[in-house]
Amino acid sequence: HTAAQDNCTCPTNKMTVCSPDGPGGRCQCRALGSGVAVDCSTLTSKCLLLKARMSAPKNARTLVRPNEHALVDNDGLYDPDCDPEGRFKARQCNQTSVCWCVNSVGVRRTDKGDLSLRCDELVRTHHILIDLRHRPTASAFNHSDLDAELRRLFRERYRLHPKFVAAVHYEQPTIQIELRQNTSQKAAGDVDIGDAAYYFERDVKGESLFQGRGGLDLRVRGEPLQVERTLIYYLDEIPPKFSMKRLT
C-alpha cells in the first residue's frame, strides 16, 4: 500500500494529491509541484517537499562548536530541481540563469555562477547539528531523560534509526542533536538524516508536514519542551568551495 487505504491520504506528507489510481485501485499519492509518486510509509525527500512548498499558495507556509566547514541555510527557499528519485540535483539554477552547487540537503556549497558552472557530483551531508534553545523551565531537564526522549522522537515520528542519532548535548537552555550518516551506513529503506532534520525543523516551527497527525508535543517526564529557536548546521563529506571574498 502506498498510502492510507481507506480515505486515500498520505500520513507522512500533507503536500500531496492522492487518488485510487494505483495498481489494483490502490491509493497513490503524488507530491505537489513535481507530480512524483511518493511512498507514504516514510518521509518524503526534502527536495520534493521544497518543490511542493514553492508551488503552494504563498500564504500556506557539552556543546559542540561547528567547524569552519559547517554550512547554514542562509539562502532561504528556492524552487529546486530534483532527480527522479526525489534527490536534489547537484546543480541548481534560478530563472535568471544564476547557478550554484548544493549538497544532499539542498544547501548551497559554492559561490553562485552562471550556466557554465559545473557540479560534478551531489556531495553528501553526513553530519547535521541541530542547535535548539528551549523556553525557560523551573529546572533543567534531566540529561539522560532528554536524550532518551529525543532519540525516541526521531525513531517514532521520523522513522530514523537511533544509530544515526550520534549524540544529544545539553547545557540549559541549549540542546544540540547530532545526526550522523555516512554513505556507507545508509541502507535501502533508511530515512535520510537530511529529511528527518527538515521534518523536525518544520515541526518545531509549528508547520508539521504530517497529515492528520498532531503537532509536535515533546515532553520529558511530563514536562513540555518548548523550542524558542532552531539553528541547523550541515557538514558535508567534502568541504564546501567558497571564495575568500565570502569568508571575510
Partner: antibody
Amino acid sequence: QSLEESGGDLVQPGASLTLTCKASGFDLNNYSILWVRQAPGKGLEWIGSIYISGGSTYYANWAKGRFAISKTSSTTVTLQMTSLTAADTATYFCARDDGTASYYLNLWGPGTLVTVSS
Amino acid sequence: YDMTQTPASVSEPVGGTVTIKCQASEDIYKLLAWYQQKPGQPPKLLIYAASDLESGVPSRFKGRGSGTDYTLTISDLEAADAATYYCQQAYTIGNIDNSFGGGTEVVVK
C-alpha cells in the same frame, strides 16, 4: 544468532531478582533489546526496552520504578526486578528488534521462569 | 495505544479459514506485527508492517489493515497452525501499558 535468558528462580514476595539476556552471533549495538513477560496461561506483556548503543531505556507505565534494564557487557543485558509479588510470576523473554526504526521482534530467547511464592 | 484483539478463541477445521482482528486505540500507521506462539515456545514473528510476510512464512498467512483496524487471515488451515496469535503495535514505546493484543487461540479441528 540467538538470545538466551537466565536467572529465573523461585523467590519470596518482596524479594529482588536480576535476569540476564545473553546474545550470541551478532553485535548488540544498533539493536534494541526488549523484555516481555507471560504469566501462566496469559498473554504477552511488554516490560521495557533498551537501545544498546545509546543506552536509552524505556518502560511500560506499570513497570516504571520497579524494573530496570541495563547493558552489562558487550553481549549481555539485564533486567533487575524489585519488590516482587505473586503477580510477577511469569516466563520472562528477551527479544531483539529487527534493526529498523520499528519495534518488530524477529529474534526471541526461549524464556526463563520466575516464580514468586512464599 | 491499547490493542484490542478479537476473538479470544476460534475453532475451524483443517482447510478452513480464520480471521483475527486487532484494533488500536489510536492510528499506528500500519506499524503492526503478528506473532504465532505455540505452548512452551517463544513467539515467532509472522507479519510486520501490517502486511509484509517474514521470511519463511507461508503465503497462507495474510495481514491487512491501516489506521486503527487490522486483520490476520489464515487460509487453508493446517494442523500445525494451531497456536495462539498476538498482534503488536510497533509504532511507539512511549507512555503505554502494553504493546501487545490479548491473543487469539486458534484450534484446528
